[in-house]
């Protein structure tokens, strides 16, 4: 029995519903009473949802899953996963048994967009050309881990003296803090770009520092 799932991972935003597609080709005369369907977490064999003996056996996965009962007879064994969480990410296997059997695994990739970065400066007053300043770019509640890029006002990448840390919260979402240490010129713009590699979404933040003219005693 050929069981078909998408080759590419299913990408779902945190908090939204995702459909994990799975289909099979029922033979003529197929009845739902013959169908055994199991959705399982591939890596742990944890039962997610099942259908047996003509009846939906329900969700075994935090009551957040559902089948499409009206479509099962046509060979649509897809699973609806509600209110997607970071912890849902991974591989799900769809097992189908009628007279024959088959299985296939589909990957769920969870994503969450990063917030617009906030920029802070230390020190933040009495700045003069030649001073060393620390610019911090902070972006929150994204997933998966971000890629962070810095550049100056001319678009030149700044790679030295950058320290980036990413911490996951209880929901598994990441807060990103990237620190750039830079010696001030007469004035300058410093931009931080936080990229979500799955969503290909960029969040930009920038700060423009106008240095006070140097005075000599």
């Amino acid at each position: 029995l050929e069981v078909q799932v998408p080759e590419d991972p299913v990408v779902a935003l945190v908090g939204t519903d995702a459909t994990l597609c799975c289909s099979f080709s029922p033979e003529p005369g197929f009845s739902l009473a013959q169908l055994n369907l199991i959705w399982q977490l591939t890596d742990t064999k944890q039962l997610v949802h099942s259908f047996a003996e003509g009846q939906d056996q329900g969700s075994a996965y935090a009551n957040r899953t559902a089948l499409f009962p009206d479509l099962l007879a046509q060979g649509n064994a897809s699973l609806r996963l509600q209110r997607v969480r970071v912890a849902d990410e991974g591989s799900f296997t769809c097992f189908v048994s009628i007279r024959d059997f088959g299985s296939a695994a589909v990957s769920l990739q969870v994503a969450a967009p990063y917030s617009k970065p906030s920029m802070t400066l230390e020190p933040n007053k009495d700045l003069r050309p030649g001073d060393t300043v620390t610019i911090t770019c902070s972006s929150y509640r994204g997933y998966p881990e971000a890629e962070v890029f810095w550049q100056d006002g001319q678009g030149v990448p700044l790679t030295g003296n950058v320290t980036t840390s990413q911490m996951a919260n209880e929901q598994g979402l990441f807060d990103v803090h990237s620190v750039l240490r830079v010696v001030l010129g007469a004035n300058g713009t410093y931009s931080c770009l936080v990229r979500n590699p799955v969503l290909q979404q960029d969040a930009h933040g920038s700060v423009t520092i106008t240095g006070q003219p140097m005075t000599f005693p």
Epitope: Q40, K45, I98
Partner: antibody, heavy 123, light 107 residues
């Protein structure tokens, strides 16, 4: 070819623990789930539990859950099964079994078997 | 737990005979059933998986069928090496469970 070599026979007293080992060769150890199945004299086969050597995840038969611990040493390609609070009913041959057929079935097919280890529990 | 019940518990037959062994599951298991052969003092050997698929190297005189709750294993023409104990196993739910076995003896 796949080979599973189990440790030698054990004689234990009631209340003691036993730790059996199963050395695997002939395949990539982390790619097959490893199971422990036992057979008391003249009795049916009884599944005790399994481990995914790749991620360390275990599933146990509730009947044994409080007494059995399955672990692996990936560097030694060896699986272990420890059974505690032994009683006379635990006298059996214990097999380690590797399942290369995942995910043909939702649980497991027992394809490659060790030679078995006889554990005798007697006072 | 899913209970697996085999019948008969033992059967006597002669070389060349056709033998059928039955296995019943206490609830529907689709086609997720396997059959094993075990000889005295040896580990079991997988014969059939998914109710009717022969494992590699298993002679074609072995066949099996069934789905749902009722399954059969048939040996079309018994050979001397077939005298052994046969077990069915459900592969749909944890805990994995086996039948009590059917002993095939020489008549």
């Amino acid at each position: 070819q796949v080979q599973l070599v189990e440790s030698g026979a054990e004689v234990k007293k009631p209340g003691a623990s036993v730790k059996l080992s199963c050395k695997a060769s002939g395949y990539t150890f982390s790619s097959y789930w490893m199971h422990w199945v036992r057979q008391a004299p003249g009795q049916r086969l009884e599944w005790m539990g399994e481990i995914n050597p790749g991620n360390g995840h275990t599933n146990y038969n509730e009947k044994f859950k409080s007494r059995v611990t399955i672990t692996v040493d990936k560097s030694a390609s060896t699986a272990y099964m420890e059974l505690s609070s032994l009683r006379s009913e635990d006298t059996a041959v214990y097999y380690c079994v590797a399942d290369p057929r995942r995910p043909k079935v939702p649980t497991a097919l027992f394809v490659y078997w060790g030679q078995g280890t006889l554990v005798t529990v007697s006072s | 737990d899913i209970q697996m019940t085999q019948s008969p518990s033992s059967v006597s037959a002669s070389v060349g005979d056709r033998v059928t062994i039955s296995c019943r599951a206490s609830q529907g298991i689709g086609t997720w059933l396997a059959w094993y052969q075990q000889k005295p003092g040896k580990a079991p050997r997988l014969l059939i998986y998914a109710a009717s698929s022969l494992d590699s190297g298993v002679p074609s005189r072995f066949s099996a069928s069934g789905s749902g709750t009722d399954f059969t294993l048939t040996i079309s023409s018994l050979q001397p090496e077939d005298f052994a104990t046969y077990y069915c196993q459900q592969a749909i739910n944890f805990p994995i469970t086996f039948g009590q076995g059917t002993r095939l003896e020489i008549k």
